[in-house]
Amino acid sequence: CKAMHVAQPAVVLASSRGIASFVCEYASPGKATEVRVTVLRQADSQVTEVCAATYMMGNELTFLDDSICTGTSSGNQVNLTIQGLRAMDTGLYICKVELMYPPPYYLGIGNGTQIYVIDPEPCPDSDF
């Protein structure tokens, strides 16, 4: 297993609709054709795999398990979007990248993106 650098933004604020997007960029030492991306959440004394996708370079990312994540890839960048977030989902979201094929296997883990989610205030009752 060889180490690889992964960069991601330090902080992202989710939209009022509970959507957060960030870019995960990895310094690929070679020409990987199969890449696996996993988003981990570290908070509340727990580590959770939020979503994971394996993709062939140039193809769309396919997430399993009715995923709340979507994403696209462009070169060594993965554009990740997490939706359906609520205030209690605030936490550190870490991007983990694995170059699966061809060998050698490379692993890179980012420092994490702190995603802040603020639940929208309910609309006040209208007099009209």
Epitope: R41, A43, D44, Q46, T48, E49, V50, C51, A52, L64, D65, D66, S67, I68, I82, G84, L85, M88, D89, G91, Y93
Partner: nanobody, 125 residues
């Protein structure tokens, strides 16, 4: 309705390993998030680990990360908790639970609708 039955608990020495099993019947097993919780007498139930419906995603409490491993076999309707490097503080009743999902960034807070009767794990020093 889902019925859950745990097995595999017992008395072990500190540092030993153990595999807890949870057999499910009824319901569509492959659509449920499955979790393991533990509870010592007189204390609150504590989240240990959870696994997504297909088994591709997992979640662990920091206290067990790296020592415990959760897995599932949807064909056999089974969930497993491999526990290693056991410590006396791991002594608890371990419960298997099922939640309708879907998977979230905080599966410990899902509503677990179905629970097993628990299996006792006692770790002696």
């Amino acid at each position: 309705e889902v019925q859950l039955v745990e097995s595999g608990g017992g008395l072990v020495q500190a540092g030993d390993s153990l595999t807890l099993s949870c057999a499910a019947s009824g319901g569509t097993f492959s659509t449920y998030v499955m979790g393991w919780f533990r509870q010592a007498s007189g204390k609150e139930r504590e989240f240990v680990a959870a696994i997504s419906p297909s088994g591709t995603l997992t979640s662990y409490a920091d206290s067990v990360k790296g020592r415990f491993g959760i897995s599932r076999d949807n064909a056999k309707k089974m969930v497993y908790l491999q526990v290693s490097s056991l410590k006396p503080e791991d002594t608890d009743v371990y419960y298997c639970a099922a939640a309708r999902g879907p998977w979230t960034p905080r599966p410990s807070l899902l509503t677990y609708d179905y629970w097993g009767q628990g299996t006792q794990v006692t770790v002696s020093s």
